[in-house]
């Protein structure tokens, strides 16, 4: 190797200056007794190199690029060799931004997978490899005092969510949770959440069913629907409130919301609907009165209201 580049910093803030030096060893100067060192950023030649012979006979060229406006580029130093450029050395330069503070950190407890799933918004593009780590600890109080640390949760590349498995959780006890973002230009941390995993529990919705008509029960009135639901068994002991939504299958009507319904109701007669009309219905529930997240809406149930009963006209017969 005849030449060697060293740079003030290979990674800088976008738009910042960067200084580089290229040294050609003495045993390479047979190429030219006074070789002129050229600089190139990407494909463009860069003027402004200051060249000098050092006391040990090596040649040095120093260049300052006033603003590195490329997020990634190769800087090379070269010599003219006949009609072509002979590249002596090159370095990769990166430019970008330190990570912004991750924001909108939120978590939910999934009782099916037995894990606490946290997600966040990473902020604007940094143009640099940036790692995110979900950090947490157990706390007896309101997270002012730190208890046992929990193993860091590292999301897969490009993902802005991470799952803390059950073995690292303690239900009914607060946890401090935050996201740390790190790249070559700095580190940032989101505001800390302090939560009990059960307070962010997201339940599975009940399953809507048609109510089986019983011989002694009166059929639904016109414009009414009788429905029941089967609660999600693993969440049965959690007090919940639920809500229904319905809309006619045809037309552009928006969903109409009915609630709150206690989970324990298990069956419901919905009235005030259009007669002889097919409706789509869904139900969802939330832990209540304790905190929690709404479940997803249940799979749809499709039911049809009964026809309006014909009006009977009474004719009086005179004898």
């Amino acid at each position: 190797e005849c030449g060697h580049i060293s740079v003030s910093a290979p990674i800088v803030h976008l738009g910042d200056p960067i200084t580089a030096s290229c040294i050609i060893k003495q045993n390479c100067s047979h190429l030219d007794p006074e070789p002129q060192i050229l600089w190139r950023l990407g494909a463009e030649l860069q003027p402004g190199g200051r060249q000098q012979r050092l006391s040990d006979g090596t040649q040095e060229s120093i260049i300052t690029l006033p603003h590195l406006n490329h997020t990634q580029a190769f800087l090379s130093c070269a010599l003219n060799w006949g009609n072509s450029l002979q590249i002596l050395d090159q370095v990769e330069l990166r430019a970008g931004y330190p990570p912004a503070i991750p924001h909108n950190l939120s978590c939910l407890m999934n009782l099916t997978t037995s894990s606490l799933i946290c997600q966040w918004e990473p902020g604007p593009e940094t143009h640099l490899p940036t790692s995110f780590t979900l950090k947490s600890f157990k706390s007896r109080g309101n997270c002012q005092t730190q208890g046992d640390s929990i193993l860091d949760c590292v999301p897969k590349d490009g993902q802005s969510h991470c799952s803390i498995p059950r073995k690292h959780l303690l239900l009914y006890q607060n946890m401090g949770i935050w996201v740390q973002a790190e790249n070559a230009l700095g580190t940032s941390m989101s505001p800390q959440l302090c939560l009990d995993p059960m307070d962010v529990v997201k339940l599975e919705p009940p399953m809507l069913r048609t109510m089986d008509p019983s011989p002694e029960a009166a059929p639904p009135q016109a414009g009414c629907l009788q429905l029941s639901w089967e609660p999600w068994q693993p969440g049965l002991h959690i007090n919940q409130k639920c809500e229904l939504r319905h809309k006619p299958q045809r037309g552009e009507a928006s969903w109409a919301l009915v609630g709150p319904l206690p989970l324990e109701a298990l069956q419901y007669e919905l009235c005030g609907l259009l007669p002889a009309t097919a409706y789509t219905l869904q139900i969802r529930c939330i832990r209540w009165p304790l905190p929690g997240h709404w479940s997803d809406w249940s799979p749809s149930l499709e039911l049809r209201t009964t026809e309006r009963a014909p009006t009977h006209h009474h004719h009086h017969h005179h004898h």
Epitope: L111, Q233, P234, I238, N239, E264, P289
Partner: antibody, heavy 118, light 107 residues
Framework: EVQLLESGGGLVQPGGSLRLSCAAS????????MGWVRQAPGKGLEWVSS????????PYADSVKGRFTISRDNSKNTLYLQMNSLRAEDTAVYYC???????????WGQGTLVTVSS | DIQMTQSPSSLSASVGDRVTITCRAS??????LNWYQQKPGKAPKLLIY???NLQNGVPSRFSGSGSGTDFTLTISSLQPEDFATYYC?????????FGGGTKVEIK
């Protein structure tokens, strides 16, 4: 401190009836599921029945279905188990317990002994 | 119905021993598995809920692990007061079922 106190156990003839009570204190009774678990002499634990916070949901073990009825009076903070058509195999210590949100029993009462014998 | 099989049904151990009790569900129950300790003439006492959560006031030598169908209760260093019968219980769905129990006796 959460406390559960069962009463109403005793000796009863086969085919007879008995009503167990469980008086609760130290927590908001109306917010929790409650349950009955029994233990025959020298045997393991057997779940009998549970009741939801407002009484609308009442699952039963197959062995007692149709004979036992669980109920609660939230105004009196009391849980009940009405036992009819009693059989010798119903002889056990009956415990009442508060159910946690994910279905564990804690705490338990001290238990009341029901003996079905002629 | 979900059946719960506990093993062993009894074991003899010495103070200071590490003791492991297993519980197997006949179908997947996620983490809905609870462990109890019962001493003669006393009501059961909750040790572990939701497979691995230590109930308040229970010594840290007790731990629970597992998910799906296979679960373990471990006592890291058996103490004199730990000689008792231990039960597992599934709370995933009704009917609720208990395991048959494991009696831990002094060797």
């Amino acid at each position: 401190e959460v406390q559960l106190l069962e009463s109403g156990g005793g000796l009863v003839q086969p085919g007879g009836s008995l009503r167990l009570s469980c008086a609760a204190s130290g927590f908001t009774f109306s917010l929790y599921w409650m349950g009955w678990v029994r233990q025959a002499p020298g045997k393991g634990l057997e779940w009998v029945s549970s009741i939801s916070s407002s009484g609308g949901v009442t699952p039963y073990a197959d062995s007692v279905k149709g004979r036992f009825t669980i109920s609660r009076d939230n105004s009196k903070n009391t849980l009940y188990l009405q036992m009819n058509s009693l059989r010798a195999e119903d002889t056990a210590v009956y415990y009442c317990a508060k159910l946690g949100e994910l279905g564990w029993f804690d705490p338990w009462g001290q238990g009341t002994l029901v003996t079905v014998s002629s | 119905d979900i059946q719960m099989t506990q093993s062993p049904s009894s074991l003899s151990a010495s103070v200071g021993d590490r003791v492991t009790i297993t519980c197997r569900a006949s179908q997947g129950i996620s983490s809905y598995l609870n462990w109890y300790q019962q001493k003669p003439g006393k009501a059961p006492k909750l040790l572990i809920y939701y497979a691995s959560n230590l109930q308040n006031g229970v010594p840290s030598r007790f731990s629970g692990s597992g998910s799906g169908t296979d679960f373990t209760l471990t006592i890291s260093s058996l103490q004199p007061e730990d000689f008792a019968t231990y039960y597992c219980q599934q709370s995933y769905m009704y009917p609720i079922k208990f395991g048959g129990g494991t009696k831990v006796e002094i060797k």
